[in-house]
């Protein structure tokens, strides 16, 4: 009762390998690494056959089929390129994930190379079977911002794409009679989060209670250049409005807030985040030059707070920007302490502007980003948010604009955004 000689399948083997097989002998068919046993269209690791009493094998020898990892998973904000010809997805084939540059970059500078493993899964040396993450690039406008050597007196029109993080925040509080409408600025931090000043998102109440406006009353415009033409802009509603829990309306201490957008916005040449600074209590160094952009800065005879409280009628049509130096803290404190009224400049604030005055000292919308270029990382970093100014008209001598010191709130911002700092390290200024 001898069974016929067995031929191992291509890319496979038979064990035990014998010259002759008799009744009740069993054979295990297996395949080389990267191949699977295929029997009746069913894939398996091994297949056993037996020599029967009548001298026949219990089954035909199966075939060995190369492992197929199939089409790789889509990567959000990423692309896939196939290293092997004909876009093969079989064992030892290679693919490369890359992010949609220049707007996204791969977390931890991963190679993005994945190989089809013997187990039939795409594997990366570092991440294993997990897909890489494409994080938004920050602080790198598609258009170069101007050199900061020459001082700009007053505001200038910003070219589209110069301030891709700039957001226009429009609040229409329909719970008020009559309806209240006002606007402010903000800065895009990621595809889903806007940083702004708390006083922009505080309900304009008849008392000093701090209550945020309802998220339903907030609209955010991104990629906006000329307010008369919103067609090219992305507008988004708010999913969450988060005011700093310690925001104090009496002195505007902790004047910082976040808006989570209903849907992540697609990044592009006119919509890109700004970088957050390091956690640093000192804040920006005195005399450093920064830029502020906004739509409310074309009116030289009103203060920032008057702009924000007077509704959209004071909007400048085209986004403006101005260049301002950081003022030493002691000098700013002294200039405000000499005024009547509660003008305390706290450690959570810094000042910017010029001693001699000029309309540039109070340009910019409330909540707008005061950005400084970081030479080390070659990125623009949000160091301040337009917060408040003196009671005098814009351009009064020794009236500096006061900004929320963002570097004091980096931990709070990451916490609200629900991201551990390690995950977003590439976004932090080096």
């Amino acid at each position: 009762n001898e069974c016929p000689e067995l031929q191992p399948p291509v890319h496979g083997k038979i064990e035990p390998s014998q010259a002759k097989y008799f009744f009740k002998d069993q054979v295990l068919v297996s395949c080389d690494t990267g191949y699977k046993v295929l029997k009746d269209n069913v894939e398996m690791d091994t297949f056993q056959i037996e020599c029967l009493k009548d001298g026949t094998w219990s089954n035909k020898i199966p075939t060995c089929k190369i492992v197929d990892c199939r089409a790789p998973g889509e990567l959000e904000h990423g692309l896939i390129t196939f290293s092997t010809r004909n876009n093969l997805t079989t064992y030892k084939s290679e693919i490369k994930y890359s992010c949609q540059e220049p707007y996204y970059k791969m977390l931890n500078n991963n190679t993005g190379i994945y190989t089809c493993s013997a187990q039939g899964v795409w594997m990366n040396k570092v991440l294993g079977r997990s897909l890489p993450t494409c994080l938004p690039e920050c602080g790198q406008p598609s258009r170069s911002l101007p050199s900061l050597v020459k001082r700009i007196i007053g505001g200038r029109n910003a070219e589209p794409g110069l301030f891709p993080w700039q957001a226009l925040i429009v609040v229409e509080d329909t719970s008020r009679v009559p309806n209240d409408k006002w606007f402010g600025s903000g800065a895009l931090l990621s595809a889903s989060w806007i940083l702004t000043a708390a006083h922009v998102l505080r309900s304009q109440r008849r008392d000093t209670t701090v209550i945020p406006v309802s998220k339903e009353h907030v609209t955010v415009y991104l990629g906006l250049h000329d307010v008369r033409d919103k067609s090219g802009a992305v507008n988004s509603s708010a999913a969450r409005v988060v005011l700093h829990p310690d925001f104090n309306i009496q002195n505007y201490n902790h004047d910082i807030a976040l808006v989570q957008l209903q849907e992540p916005v697609p990044l592009g040449p006119h919509v890109m985040p700004v970088c957050l600074p390091r956690l640093e209590p000192e804040g920006p160094a005195p005399h450093m030059l920064g830029l502020v952009a906004g739509w409310g800065i074309s009116n030289p005879n009103v203060t920032v707070d008057e702009i924000i409280s007077s509704g959209t009628r004071t909007l400048s049509d085209v986004l403006q920007y101005v260049k301002l130096p950081v003022v030493p803290h002691a000098e700013c404190k002294t200039s405000y302490e000499s005024r009547s009224g509660n003008y305390s400049v706290t450690e959570n604030m810094f000042c910017a502007g010029y001693y001699e005055g000029g309309k540039d000292t109070c340009l910019g919308d409330s909540g707008g980003a005061f950005v400084i270029f970081d030479d080390l990382s070659q990125r623009w970093v949000v160091q301040g948010l337009v917060s408040w100014g003196g009671p005098e008209e814009c351009g009064s001598k020794q009236v500096y604009g006061v900004y929320t010191k963002v570097s004091n709130y980096v931990d709070w911002v990451w916490e609200q955004m629900g991201l551990p700092q390690s995950v977003v390290e590439p976004q932090v200024e080096r």
Epitope: S175, R206, S309, W388
Partner: antibody, heavy 114, light 112 residues
């Protein structure tokens, strides 16, 4: 339209507690605060406290903070003001107001008498 | 605590004449950041809840006749009824909302 409807008049003995309700309708209850004010017969207005239904934040007049408790039930859009250890000088009309005093309840007379 | 003091306690004015009520606070009600004075005026008629007339010292509430106006800043405020009508007979209260809330003691306005 916005309406604040308060519970009916109460007569209480000294030392007892009273709980006045204020049912809101016609607006989103959680988007604005509720204030409680009282007025003793022939006297002026006296602020008791404030509650914000969205997060249950409260503020009290120091005079009432040990005896008054403000609560809300967002499922029924109702605010409550409980005053304990009642004394005769607590006899007053108690008002709730909302949307920053744009709308007021009709008032609830609480009489404290032995 | 902020103390609010109204004057006079009562006022009799002829129909069509101007009525002026003053309110003084024990500390400034002007917020230097928002640039608003957190002072409101209320009207209360017998058996009715108070009615908000003016907020932020000078902003008239929707639906309030323009004969009612508010003025002042810091610690001194005024409610003016430019031409008194019969339906204006009531008690008027000022209220600060700068730090919690405090009402003035009230001013009774009658027709002379």
């Amino acid at each position: 339209q916005v309406q604040l409807v308060q519970s009916g008049a109460e007569v209480k003995k000294p030392g007892a507690s009273v709980k006045v309700s204020c049912k809101a309708s016609g607006y989103t209850f959680t988007t604005d605060d509720i204030n409680w004010v009282r007025q003793a017969p022939g006297q002026g207005l006296e602020w008791i406290g404030w509650i914000y239904p969205r997060d249950d934040r409260t503020k009290y007049n120091d005079k009432f903070k040990d005896r008054a408790t403000l609560t809300v039930d967002t499922s029924s859009n109702t605010a409550y003001m409980e005053l304990s250890s009642l004394r005769s000088e607590d006899t007053a009309v108690y008002y709730c107001s909302s949307l920053e005093d744009t709308y007021w309840g009709q008032g609830t007379l609480v009489t404290v008498s032995s | 605590d902020i103390v609010m003091t109204q004057s006079p306690d009562s006022l009799a004015v002829s129909l069509g004449e101007r009525a002026t009520i003053n309110c003084k606070s024990s500390q400034s009600l002007l917020n230097s950041r928002t640039r608003k004075n957190y002072l409101a005026w209320y009207q209360q008629k017998p058996g009715q809840p108070p009615k908000l007339l003016i907020y932020w010292a000078s902003t008239r509430e929707s639906g309030v006749p323009d004969r009612f106006s508010g003025s002042g800043s810091g610690t001194d405020f005024t409610l003016t009824i430019s031409s008194l009508q019969a339906e204006d007979v009531a008690v008027y209260y000022c209220k600060q909302s700068y730090n919690l809330y405090t009402f003035g003691q009230g001013t009774k306005v009658e027709i002379k």
